[in-house]
C-alpha cells in the first residue's frame, strides 16, 4: 500500500506512446 | 552550480554489507529521480536501480534485487544504497546520477565523481 | 535477454566524420540516449532522445535511432572528443540497458 506522504508524487513506469510520445520510456504521472 | 557526491566505499569481505551516500546539491533533490550505476574496471556501465519522487516508486536491476536497496532523504538530499549480501561481481566503482527532469525522464543528466567499492577477502 | 552492442573501437582523423553505432532488438521503438566519458572521469550525457543535446553539447555531436540501430554522429572531430561512448535505453521499469562502450581515437 502507498504511503500516505506519497499520495501526490507522480509515479514513474515504463510504457510505449504514453507522455506524449511515440516511442517506448520511462513516463512519470500523478 | 549542480553537483553530486558519493562516499562511503571502501574494501569489504564477501557476505557483508556497505552502504553508500550521495550528496546532491545546486538543485530541487525532491523533484528529481535518482538512480545508481555501477561500473567494474576497465568494464562498462550498468545500471543498478532507481528510486522515482515517492518512496515507494522504486526499481533494481535483476543482478542486486534482494540484496540492495535504494532509498533517499529529501530533508538532507542524500541518496542511499544498502549493499547487503556483496560479492565479488559487486566490486566496480558507483556512481550516482540524475534523472532529467520532467514527465518523460528516459536519460541520466548529471552523475558524481563516483566512489570505489572493492568486494574481497 | 535483450543486449546492445556497439563496436569495439572506432578510429576517425581530426576534422573527419566519425560514427558509432548502437544495435539491439527494435531499439527503434525505444528512446536512445548517448554518453561520454574521458579517461578517467564521470560519464557526461551528449544526446538523449535520439536526436537531442543538452545545452552545453557542441552542435557537432548529433544522433538518430530507427529499425535496431541508434547513431551518435561526431562531425568535425577534435582531439577532445576521444573517449568513450555508451548508448542507453530502457527495455523496462527495471532493465535500462547499456552498450559495451566504443572507444573513440582520433588520430
Known amino acids: 500500500r502507498r504511503r500516505r506522504r506519497d499520495t501526490h508524487f507522480p509515479i514513474c513506469i515504463f510504457c510505449c506512446g504514453c507522455c506524449h510520445r511515440s516511442k517506448c520510456g520511462m513516463c512519470c504521472k500523478t | 552550480q549542480v553537483q553530486l557526491v558519493e562516499s562511503g566505499g571502501g574494501v569489504v569481505q564477501p557476505g557483508r554489507s556497505l552502504r553508500l551516500s550521495c550528496a546532491a546539491s545546486g538543485f530541487t533533490f525532491s523533484s528529481y529521480g535518482m538512480h545508481w550505476v555501477r561500473q567494474a574496471p576497465g568494464k562498462g556501465l550498468e545500471w543498478v536501480a532507481v528510486i522515482w519522487y515517492a518512496e515507494s516508486n522504486k526499481y533494481y536491476a535483476d543482478s542486486v534485487k534482494g540484496r540492495f536497496t535504494i532509498s533517499r532523504d529529501n530533508s538532507k538530499n542524500t541518496l542511499y544504497l544498502q549493499m547487503n549480501s556483496l560479492r565479488a561481481e559487486d566490486t566496480a566503482v558507483y556512481y550516482c546520477?540524475?534523472?532529467?527532469?520532467?514527465?518523460?525522464?528516459?536519460?541520466?543528466?548529471?552523475w558524481g565523481q563516483g566512489t570505489m567499492v572493492t568486494v574481497s577477502s | 535477454c535483450y543486449e546492445l552492442t556497439q563496436p569495439p573501437s572506432v578510429s576517425v582523423s581530426p576534422g573527419q566524420t566519425a560514427t558509432i553505432t548502437c544495435s539491439g532488438d527494435?531499439?527503434?521503438?525505444?528512446?536512445a540516449s548517448w554518453y561520454q566519458q574521458r579517461p578517467g572521469q564521470s560519464p557526461v550525457l551528449v544526446i538523449y532522445?535520439?536526436?537531442k543535446r543538452p545545452s552545453g553539447i557542441p552542435e557537432r555531436f548529433s544522433g538518430s535511432n530507427s529499425g535496431n540501430t541508434a547513431t551518435l554522429t561526431i562531425s568535425g572531430t577534435q582531439a577532445m572528443d576521444e573517449a568513450d561512448y555508451f548508448c542507453q535505453a530502457w527495455y523496462s521499469s527495471t532493465n535500462v540497458l547499456f552498450g559495451g562502450g566504443t572507444k573513440l581515437t582520433v588520430l
Open positions: 546520477a540524475r534523472a532529467q527532469e520532467g514527465i518523460a525522464p528516459d536519460a541520466f543528466d548529471i
Open positions: 527494435k531499439l527503434g521503438e525505444r528512446y
Open positions: 532522445q535520439d536526436i
